[in-house]
Every structure is written in structure tokens, then in C-alpha cells.
Amino acid sequence: TQHGIRLPLRSGLGGAPLGLRLPRETDEEPEEPGRRGSFVEMVDNLRGKSGQGYYVEMTVGSPPQTLNILVDTGSSNFAVGAAPHPFLHRYYQRQLSSTYRDLRKGVYVPYTQGKWEGELGTDLVSIPHGPNVTVRANIAAITESDKFFINGSNWEGILGLAYAEIARPDDSLEPFFDSLVKQTHVPNLFSLQLCGAGFPLNQSEVLASVGGSMIIGGIDHSLYTGSLWYTPIRREWYYEVIIVRVEINGQDLKMDCKEYNYDKSIVDSGTTNLRLPKKVFEAAVKSIKAASSTEKFPDGFWLGEQLVCWQAGTTPWNIFPVISLYLMGEVTNQSFRITILPQQYLRPVEDVATSQDDCYKFAISQSSTGTVMGAVIMEGFYVVFDRARKRIGFAVSACHVHDEFRTAAVEGPFVTLDMEDCGYNIPQTDESTLMTGRA
């Protein structure tokens, strides 16, 4: 099919088409009151796309100022544009908020490329398509930035959903989600369904389309199929997990599993690509090239730089392999695997050739800071950030793009020994010197 089948975002909600649904497995965990079921008001509350990030609407201040905020599980600051910028349609105007409190403290966040800096304060914050609560949260008012805001992305700030340990300027600055849980009865859990379109969206299409769902405080059954499988959060800073095995089309990469997690593996909605440590990236690309050898592509494509185009509807998905990441399970010596399709790791790009072509960038790239399971991975799955139980759950997303032959999968259990040895122990240095490089 032209762009692969895109499953509907929901079944029977708000008049959405029923479309194709994968059969639900029956061996699910028992219901947990208040944490599972239907969260209709939060379904479809995200917009955006993998290349520029997914954002949720939030209000800040009194009277409320509405802003679109990037959902980022790879950082821990709530930071919003607070001064005019060429790429911002609107920004937080602290002087107009009667509830703003200045913390009289600055914050500076450098990235590998770019940076932002601002002034810390607190204000009242709510999420219109979220829980019906208002919380006083720390806010970094961004006054200066470089290569941070994205032209045409339609978001004006960032919601860092990771833990206090990586908050800037230091771990004493309480992240938004911690404030939310402390001040309300919202359970300490959120879940994300990021929906890649499978084809490029222009600016107006992004604004009109659904990008997915952020369910705050629970799990919505309509957003996934099959079972949820959980992997432990190794350490509460980033959402760090442990990968124990990697396969390309079922072929084991056969590397020391420590390499997969060197120097960490994280789940990060604010990163576009699946990023892999240098050695792992090279082995993976070699294997993907071998699997797709009936066609050859230039080196620049494998570096994520050049676009490859095919006549519309003729993208040869079948020549590209599936990629499986095995994650440590909750039970000793037990793992499970998540499998993504080329429909996830070939990212559709705005048409730079002609409207008669479908063009893609290779969305797996090299990392010097460990594995980053970015949007291209997350777009295949419904991902549950169960902070209360220090675990992350994966299930097949009801909106993932696939074709008639293959689908993304979450499968287990598998027997895997010595999984603890797969984790890398970072030498203890001052964490504040870490660069937060993202791509």
C-alpha cells in the first residue's frame, strides 16, 4: 500500500473509524483501580511529528496563557519561551501573570549544538486536555537561545518529564511531574502514544492532524493491542533501561551486551532517531545493508544525511529488515523484545523531490552518549512510564504504521542469563558537566 496501513488512533471514540485492529491478547495483568481504563479527555492531545517533536497544549499563569509544549522524556526542566524569537508565534509573558513568582536565579542549558538560558520562577500550570488540576510548578523562562526552537514546529516550550537528578541548574529544582504528583491525587505514572504519519505532513496538516496521546496518571486500553511488557528503570535520572540483545531480521548482532548500553540506554521522546553507540551502529548498519542488498544506497543515506526517494507508493519496505531490541524483563533471567519496522526507522521527509515521490531519511544514527530510543522507536509502541513501580512498559501501538505483511511487535518471555552484566557503570563524575546532546 502507498504509505503502509495506518491504524486509527482509537476504536469507537469520538466517531473515529474502526479500521484494522490487531486482536487483543487476554493474558493481561488485572485492572488497577484509577490507573487503567479510559482517559477519553486525554486521548489525541498531542500533535507534531518525529522530526520536530510532539507537543501538548498547556496553560501557564493567571489569567492562563496557552502555549504548545514539547513532550520530552529525556530532560527534566519545564522551560518556555519568554521573550520574542523569530520562530515563536507566542511566548510566556510573566508580567501579565498575577501568580508568577521570581526565584531570582538563572539557568543555562548547553547542548552539543545550541543552548538555551533563562530565569527561574514558579507559576500555576495546567494541561487543558489532561487531568483537571492546576499545580504550582517551576518554570524556566527562556530569554535567550541558540538552535533550540525549530522553525515551523509550532511549540514554544519543553516539558522535561525525566527525574530531578538531571534537572538544571541542579537536582534541587523539582520537575513538573514531581510537582503534579505531590500536589494532586494524580498517580505517579504517565503513558505516551506517538503516532508517526508514515508520510510527510506539511505545516497545516500537522496542525490539523493528531500526533498521539499523553495519558497523565494512567493507561488507556484503546491505545494499544496485545500485552504490556515491562522493563525496569535502572536508575532514576533519564529513563534508563537495559538492552540485552539486538537482532536484525532475527539475526543476532552477537556483541557483548554491554556495548548496547555504553554508556547508557534511555527512552527519549525528545530525540528523533534511534541512536546507537558507535560500534553497535556500525554493526547494525552493516547488517541492514546486507539484508537490503538488492538495492544499494549512498553512504550519505546511511549517515542520515541524504534522502532516498521512490515513486509514490512503491517504497520497497520488504527489502528492509525488522529490528528487534531485547529488554531486561521484570523477572530474573527473563527478557522480552520490541520489534520495529522500516516504516518506523525510515522517516518520511517533506517532499523535496516531487509530489510523485515518497522520500525518506534513515533515522538510525550514531551516538557517543549511549543508546537513545527516540521517536522512531516510540512511534511503534504505546509506552508506559510507570514511575511508581520504577518500570517502563511497551505494547504495540494502535496507531503504528505497518503494511500487510509485517507489524511492530512486543513479544516474550525469552530466557536471557546474566542480564545485570549488560549495564554499564558510568564512572562517577560531576553530572553537571554532562552535555545533553540530542538529535
Epitope: 538488492t294 538495492e295 550519505g300 526517494c309 523535496v352 523531490a353 522520500c359
Partner: antibody, heavy 120, light 108 residues
Framework: QLQLQESGPGLVKPSETLSLTCTVS??????????WGWIRQPPGKGLEWIGN???????YYNPSLRGRVTISVDTSKNQFSLKLSSVTAADTAVYYC????????????WGRGTLVTVSS | EIVLTQSPATLSLSPGERATLSCRAS??????LAWFQQKPGQAPRLLIY???NRATGIPARFSGSGSGTDFTLTISSLEPEDFAVYYC??????????FGGGTKVEIK
Amino acid sequence: QLQLQESGPGLVKPSETLSLTCTVSGGSISSSSYYWGWIRQPPGKGLEWIGNIYYSGSTYYNPSLRGRVTISVDTSKNQFSLKLSSVTAADTAVYYCARLGHGYNYFDLWGRGTLVTVSS
Amino acid sequence: EIVLTQSPATLSLSPGERATLSCRASQSVSSYLAWFQQKPGQAPRLLIYDASNRATGIPARFSGSGSGTDFTLTISSLEPEDFAVYYCQQVYVWPPRTFGGGTKVEIK
């Protein structure tokens, strides 16, 4: 030293099919290091890419010519061919075959070209 | 579609002079750009690839520069055999498809 040589009729009638062959000598068309392509140049005008082929048979075509163009490869003869159907006077051009090298990116070796005139 | 605009259309210079040819892309093509030389009655010849790398056998007087949207081919001192038409081509979008309209370097 690898060389490319185009061959085929120099005159084709309107609405008929233009057929050209490129013979590769001094090297193998089955090399995994190259794609092979066709480019044309109307008299006094610029260059227009027609399409590419890999020895496995995988093809890419210029969107403006799709539906009319077919490129095929015969590894046993070390040749690849171009067919362009339903030709008009606008298809009159010098047709070049070329090798796409430098990591499949650049046309680094060209045939001398053959002029094909479409006229009744 | 990425459009490559070459300027000037014609450049009239004398042997020994420096020639500067421009190629502008309608959107960024990174460094994925080539320059070709074509003499009358001959096939094009690859001069420069990846914006600045000289192809095999190309004299050092030819140099390429630029990235993103603006590229330059410079011939430091024109030799009689350099009078020809020069084309740029982008390969950021693959397979390579777009050529510029050409710049003719003629004897003044």
C-alpha cells in the same frame, strides 16, 4: 580501462519507441560499486536525468518520464538498455549512458553520446 | 522540487583570468553537489564532487566550495581548454536527478 558505448537507431518516428543500448567494456556491469544511468541533452539545452539501474535490476526513473521509460540490464552481455515509448519531437536529444560512482552519487564516467532524432 | 540556479548564464573572460561560477539551490543540499564540464560535441566530465573534492585527473586550478544552498566553482587561471559549459548537480535527494541550467565560459 572501463568504457561505455551507446548504440541504437538515430532516427525514430513520432509515437514509436526509442531503444538504445549501452555496452560496458573493460569492466563488469555486475560490480556492486556502481549504478548505471541514462542522461539526455536536447540540442542547445541542458542535461536531464532519465533513470538508473543496478545490476540486480533495481530501477529509478525521472518522475517526468515515468510511464514511458524502461531501463533494463543484461549482465550476460554486460549491457543495459533504455526504452522510451510514445516519443515526440521533444524527445530529440543526445542520449548519454553513464556510470554512477563515488558511492552511487556521481556520474563519474560517460559514454560519448548518441543523437536520436524524432521525426516522421 | 529542488531547483539549481546557475549564474551568470555566460561568463566572458580571457585566458589567465580567474573564473567564478555560482550555483544556488532552492533549499539546502548539504555538501552533496557536483560540477561538470562539457565541451562542444563531447560528453560531460566530472570535475568536483561533494562540493569541494576534485575528481581523478582534474587539475588543481579547479576548486569547489560552499555548502547548504550556495556553491562556487573557481578556475584560478583559465587555460584555453577550460572554455566550455559548466553544470552543477545536486545529489542530496537520491537518486541524483537535478542539474543546473549551465554557465558558458567563453573567450572574451
